[in-house]
């Protein structure tokens, strides 16, 4: 369960892949499309509001019913729209929604060495946001394999204009 309904902190950042391609968002026919592309040098990177939440693990060893905390994140590139996992279609989509946000909008944040992150679906453990054919998709990762596979690694570049949503 998510510990509190308020995020513990928020930040504004641009999102890029391990190979430095930018994640961009375009309004097309009244819905948003997500692209993974090489940006031209003078083009501004799209911003995403990341809201961080704490979530408790169910206990397996500790006697108090919880065994540690996970850090979860929601990603919003524009007001009232959030990235969501569509597990049936193995896709990542932008949906307009109101709070409280559905579970599909929450991703467990994993820090990776070399200061990359990955995003694991709250609703489908072992499934991560990844890059497939120049789009974001949901990718199943076998935990026995190294979770460092490049297609699920992302870089966050904070934009220091503090925490106000960009409309």
């Amino acid at each position: 369960s998510i510990t509190g309904i308020s995020p513990i902190t928020e930040s504004l950042a641009s999102l890029s892949t391990y190979n430095d391609q930018s994640i961009t968002f375009a309004l097309e026919d009244e819905s948003y499309e997500i692209y993974v592309e090489d940006l031209k040098k003078d083009k501004k990177k799209d911003k995403v509001l990341l809201s961080y939440y704490e979530s408790q693990h169910p206990s397996s060893e500790s006697g108090d019913g919880v065994d540690g905390k996970m850090l979860m994140v929601t990603l919003s590139p524009t007001k009232d729209f959030w990235l969501q996992a569509n597990n049936k279609e193995h896709s990542v989509e932008l949906h307009k929604c109101e709070k409280p946000l559905p579970d599909q909008a929450f991703f467990v944040l994993h820090n990776r060495s070399f200061n990359c992150v990955s995003f694991e679906c709250k609703t489908d453990p072992g499934v991560f946001i990844g890059v497939k054919d120049n789009h974001l998709a949901l990718i199943k990762v076998d935990y026995s394999e190294n979770l460092g596979s490049e297609n699920i690694l992302f870089k966050l570049s904070e934009i220091l204009e503090h925490h106000h949503h960009h409309h």
């Epitope: 397996s60 060893e61 500790s62 905390k69 850090l71 944040l109 060495s113 904070e158």
Partner: antibody, heavy 122, light 107 residues
Framework: EVQLVESGGGLVQPGGSLRLSCAAS????????MHWVRQAPGKGLEYVST????????YYADSVKGRFTISRDNSKNTLYLQLGSLRPEDMAVYYC???????????????WGQGTLVTVSS | DIQMTQSPSSVSASVGDRVTITCRAS??????LAWYQQKPGKAPKLLIY???NLQSGVPSRFSGSGSGTDFTLTITSLQPEDFATYYC?????????FGPGTKVDIK
């Protein structure tokens, strides 16, 4: 209750080696990245090394890179730090620490061992 | 590597005083800053994480604020058990780095 207990410290000559252990209990060890931090006598805290939950990714401070090796045995709930080519400036209390979040280091370190002293002297 | 600085390096204060310690990062670290308290011969203890979140069991007289590069730890009414050394740590990126510490002692 989360417990981290370090052992293996002692007196070693310059150029020598030592293996530190950190026995963990009270939590699911295999879900956490773990860290080593050291503190020279009368000085501040210095980050040393990190290992991820399943042991396949490690990271070292420049000051110890190539000389120290971090590892873990999840079946024994134990974290290790192999210290090699020891120098006088490595003399410190070595702490193991657990990060606040299972999957993310952003929350800092919420549990620390009591420390084990490594003395490097001829 | 991200460098962390703290000021003051030491402060003399009395029980009941308000004490403020500042920490500055050499580059932006979002809100990923932790504060620790350490007493002589003891391990550090986490007080604040993610810049402003109080660790479970820590008294509410401790508070943290800031984001980006500038952060503050405030003790609103100093208690006898608060005399210790306080460290900030950036938890944004490897290698994690600590500030040099601020010693709070009795005036």
């Amino acid at each position: 209750e989360v417990q981290l207990v370090e052992s293996g410290g002692g007196l070693v000559q310059p150029g020598g080696s030592l293996r530190l252990s950190c026995a963990a209990s009270g939590f699911t060890f295999s879900t956490y990245s773990m860290h080593w931090v050291r503190q020279a006598p009368g000085k501040g805290l210095e980050y040393v090394s990190t290992i991820n939950n399943n042991g396949d990714t490690t990271y070292y401070a420049d000051s110890v890179k190539g000389r120290f090796t971090i590892s873990r045995d999840n079946s024994k709930n134990t974290l290790y730090l192999q210290l090699g080519s020891l120098r006088p400036e490595d003399m410190a209390v070595y702490y193991c620490a657990r990060q606040t979040y299972t999957s993310s280091w952003y929350g800092g370190f919420d549990s620390w061992g009591q420390g084990t002293l490594v003395t490097v002297s001829s | 590597d991200i460098q962390m600085t703290q000021s003051p390096s030491s402060v003399s204060a009395s029980v009941g005083d308000r004490v403020t310690i500042t920490c500055r990062a050499s580059q932006g670290i979002t809100s990923w800053l932790a504060w620790y308290q350490q007493k002589p011969g003891k391990a550090p203890k986490l007080l604040i994480y993610a810049a402003s979140n109080l660790q479970s069991g820590v008294p509410s007289r401790f508070s943290g604020s800031g984001s980006g590069t500038d952060f503050t730890l405030t003790i609103t009414s100093l208690q006898p058990e608060d005399f210790a050394t306080y460290y900030c740590q950036q938890a944004n990126s490897l290698p994690f780095t600590f500030g040099p510490g601020t010693k709070v002692d009795i005036k």
